[in-house]
């Protein structure tokens, strides 16, 4: 499966909104900083069958998607730039959904990645569990959406490395 | 390869501006801040302020609030410390170093090689 | 702006000495606390961060702890190129601020 040049134009895309969503300053919110153990090795892209990578990217923009889609998110952010950014998330989870399903039927390999799904999904587990600890504050927002931001580069070098195998 | 490289030393006099730059390259420079550091000879290191260059976001230390200013660019992945009206003593290594910002990564990982300013009539 | 006060402020030591160098805050700064390492004419090297991950490349005779206030960088075998100056810095608020360093010195 060749994701669409579309789509690596929308991971850019959905960064740069992701960048224009910072309402307060960085440096007031230094104390809030948090360790939610990103899980870098599924990242990496060198163990993966193709298949196995992208339905980790999926998954990966499927937590941040459901993330932004939340009332608490809504109230946090500026709402056309959510909105914007919520689309171009929403994109790429057709055009990776479509790669599912093709490269599954192709490699054969529908539960190899459980555990690294499974990592993902407590990764975000973490980040919900931290902003609900700090009561959803700003500061907590802003730590979780430079968290994204590093998380959602992560996954567009790996998309990069997909695109290279091909 | 993650490298910040600075401009090479300076020699002053008294009442002179100055520039001095450090140029990040090996990583995504909007995604780290960049902090500049002073080292009088022979002393302890003291932290002047840091700029975050997706932004140009800067906040100074209380002792240098005034002194000098923080500025960077990011289309070419440079930060700049510059002083508008030397003194003698602003005679200094002066260092850059990149913070993670708000994420989750080890501080000040990478460091310039320093720029020694002499200021002297 | 928060405090940083180091001890000693240099020591004499041997090579394969146990070294410790404390470090205190004026105030809590949780476990935000890295320490440096700067050896003359240098950039300072950064050992440790979050008072007790071991930077990357770092050898594991460097070890830091602490939380609070309390802070101590320890060497469990000193090298002979570990004869540097030790520095600690909070980096929980801004103006983030360093401690005035601590001298190892070959005895």
């Known amino acids: 499966c060749d994701l669409p040049q579309t789509h690596s134009l929308g991971n850019r895309r959905a960064l740069i909104l992701l960048a224009q969503m910072g309402r307060i300053s960085h440096f007031s919110c230094l104390k809030d900083r948090h360790d939610f153990g990103f899980p870098e090795e599924e990242f990496d892209g060198h163990q993966f069958q193709k298949a196995q990578a992208i339905s980790v990217l999926h998954e990966m923009i499927q937590q941040t998607f459901n993330l932004f889609s939340t009332e608490d998110s809504s109230a946090a952010w500026e709402q056309s730039l959510l909105e914007k950014f919520s689309t171009e998330l929403y994109q790429q989870l057709n055009d990776l959904e479509a790669c599912v399903i093709q490269e599954v039927g192709v490699e054969e390999t529908p539960l190899m990645n459980e555990d690294s799904i499974l990592a993902v999904r407590k990764y975000f587990q973490r980040i919900t569990l931290y902003l609900t600890e700090k009561k959803y504050s700003p500061c907590a927002w802003e730590v979780v959406r430079a968290e994204i931001m590093r998380s959602l580069s992560f996954s567009t070098n790996l998309q990069k490395r997909l695109r290279r195998k091909d | 390869e993650v490298q910040l490289v600075q401009s090479g030393a300076e020699v002053k006099k008294p009442g002179e501006s100055l520039k001095i730059s450090c140029k990040g390259s090996g990583y995504s420079f909007t995604s780290y801040w960049i902090g500049w550091v002073r080292q009088m000879p022979g002393k302890g290191l003291e932290w002047m302020g840091i700029?975050?260059?997706?932004?140009?976001?800067?906040r100074y230390s209380p002792s240098f609030q005034g002194q000098v200013t923080i500025s960077a660019d990011k289309s070419i992945s440079t930060a700049y410390l510059q002083w508008s009206s030397l003194k003698a003593s602003d005679t200094a290594m002066y260092y850059c170093a990149r913070h993670p910002g708000l994420n989750w990564a080890p501080d000040f990982d990478y460091w310039g090689q320093g720029t020694l300013v002499t200021v002297s009539s | 702006d928060i405090q940083m006060t180091q001890s000693p402020s240099s020591l004499s030591a041997s090579v394969g000495d146990r070294v410790t160098i404390t470090c205190r805050a004026s105030q809590s700064i949780n476990r935000f606390l890295n320490w440096y390492q700067q050896k003359p004419g240098k950039a300072p090297k950064l050992l440790i961060y979050?008072?007790?991950s071991l930077q990357s490349g770092v050898p594991s005779r460097f070890s830091g702890s602490g939380s609070g206030t309390d802070f101590t960088l320890t060497i469990s075998s000193l090298q002979p190129e570990d004869f540097a100056t030790y520095y600690c810095?909070?980096?929980?608020?801004?103006?983030?601020?360093f401690g005035q360093g601590t001298k190892v010195e070959i005895k």
């Open positions: 810095q909070q980096a929980i608020d801004l103006p983030f601020t």
């Open positions: 979050a008072a007790s």
């Open positions: 700029i975050d260059p997706s932004d140009s976001d800067t």
